[in-house]
Interface confidence: medium
């Protein structure tokens, strides 16, 4: 029987900068009934805060509601892992709200061909942002990454869309069938997950770009 | 307004032992980890040793491990890094060094530094 | 260990140009848990201790002027002065604190022609 072997404070994430979560990987147990608290401090103060809700995240974890996070201040949190022989710190995590945000998928992927009669035809993309974040405050730019393949193929083509939520791909193979997915990304934080794939039958009389 | 002052330092012969001190004013000294960072006559920084909040946690560069020991007595606010067997290749002015957090993160404050000199 | 190497080691610049100084990590400093970079600059002028400029690789330590900037991520950062100034004469290091031993680039002499 041991003290508990050091804990790994691994992720925080936030999905909007209104609330965040984080996460550990507990040490070793020493072969004991160990229990886990997580306390921060925000930069510039000294007195500390226990997690305000070990639930919400689901286990190993610790999630900042609305009235425990703020944009504007720093945070710095350890671990402590504590049975009946000793306890363990984590090292500390600084934890900087406006870092670690990964928005949801975009939403409404709608895929069209569009065949003009005087321009060569295109595969139009669009999209709107996930709903939890609010582009309209200016606190945010997201920024856009289209992902396609035919159904068969193993590689994927990727575009950059930068802010807009509309993308024309010009480029594709006659009567084949695409997979085309979205993504989102803020400026300082980490990429959505991909949105579920959308299908597009491309015609046989669609002509590639030259 | 922070102030680190280190003393301790001078002439010693190769083998012998020092005991630097950095006398920390301006800040909770019991809230950060303080390290000692060195840097030879004409030459680079070199980081030796670094203690975080928890006093257990101590940290040395490989070219001391086993002969630098590290140490803080919060009450005193004063951080303390004792050298044995020295030789002549530990000649630097040596720094006590703030950091910006409880651990080690980025050195926001440095004292004046303080000489030591291995020679024979 | 992270090796840290910078470059040039030395440059001499005009009063008000633009300047740039690159530091190369041997690995990634980029912290995937917070989504920062562990790196720190500094600038040491003769006979002082040296003086915290930027951390996180992009954040200025206050009191630092905004002529002073830092940018990079994973193994490639810059530290630019936007104009330089007679008083940034010194010597420039790169500094990881992602892993011990924690390690400073040869550094950089910048003077002024």
């Known amino acids: 029987q041991l003290p508990p072997g050091k804990p790994e404070i691994f992720k925080c994430r936030s999905p909007n900068k209104e609330t965040f979560t984080c996460w550990w990987r507990p040490g070793t147990d020493g072969g004991l009934p160990t229990n886990y608290s997580l306390t921060y401090h925000r930069e510039g103060e000294t007195l500390m805060h226990e997690c305000p809700d070990y639930i919400t995240g689901g286990p190993n974890s610790c999630h900042f509601g609305k009235q425990y996070t703020s944009m504007w201040r720093t945070y710095i949190m350890m671990v402590n892992a504590t049975n009946q022989m000793g306890s363990s710190f984590s090292d500390e995590l600084y934890v900087d709200v406006t870092y670690i945000v990964q928005p949801d998928p975009p939403l409404e992927l709608a895929v069209e061909v569009k065949q003009p009669e005087d321009r060569k035809p295109y595969l139009w993309i669009k999209w709107s942002p996930p709903t939890l974040i609010d582009l309209k405050t200016g606190w945010f730019t997201l920024l856009y990454e289209i992902r396609l393949k035919p159904e068969k193929a193993a590689e994927w083509e990727i575009h950059f869309a930068g802010q807009q939520t509309e993308f024309k791909i010009l480029s594709l193979h006659p009567g084949q069938k695409y997979l085309v997915q979205v993504r989102c990304k803020p400026d300082h934080g980490y990429w959505s997950a991909w949105s579920p794939a959308t299908f597009i039958q491309i015609p046989s009389d669609f002509t590639m770009n030259d | 307004e922070v102030q680190l002052l280190e003393s301790g330092g001078g002439l010693v012969q190769p083998g012998g032992t020092l005991r630097l001190s950095c006398a920390a004013s301006?800040?909770?000294?019991?809230?950060?980890?303080m390290s000692w960072v060195r840097q030879a006559p004409g030459k680079g920084l070199e980081w030796v040793s670094s203690i975080n909040v928890r006093a257990g946690d101590t940290y040395y560069a490989d070219s001391v491990k086993g002969r630098f020991t590290i140490s803080r007595d919060n009450s005193k606010n004063t951080l303390f890094l004792l050298m044995n067997s020295l030789r002549a290749e530990d000649t630097a002015a040596y720094y006590c060094?703030?950091?910006?957090?409880?651990?080690?993160?980025?050195?926001?404050?440095w004292g004046q530094g303080t000489l030591v000199t291995v020679s024979s | 260990d992270i090796v840290m190497t910078q470059s040039p080691d030395s440059l001499t610049v005009s009063l008000g140009a633009r300047t740039t100084i690159n530091c190369q990590s041997s690995?990634?400093?980029?912290?995937?848990?917070?989504?920062?970079?562990?790196l720190a600059w500094y600038q040491q002028k003769p006979g002082l201790p040296p003086k915290l400029l930027i951390y996180w690789s992009s954040t200025r330590e206050s009191g630092v002027p905004d002529r002073f900037s830092g940018s990079g991520s994973g193994t490639d950062f810059t530290l630019t002065i936007s104009s330089l100034q007679a008083e940034d004469v010194a010597i420039y290091y790169c500094?990881?604190?992602?892993?011990?031993?924690?390690?400073f680039g040869q550094g950089t002499k910048l003077e002024i022609n």
């Open positions: 301006g800040f909770t000294f019991s809230a950060y980890a």
């Open positions: 060094a703030k950091a910006r957090y409880s651990s080690n993160w980025g050195f926001d404050f």
């Open positions: 500094q990881q604190y992602s892993n011990t031993p924690y390690t």
């Open positions: 690995q990634t400093i980029l912290h995937s848990s917070n989504n920062h970079n562990y």
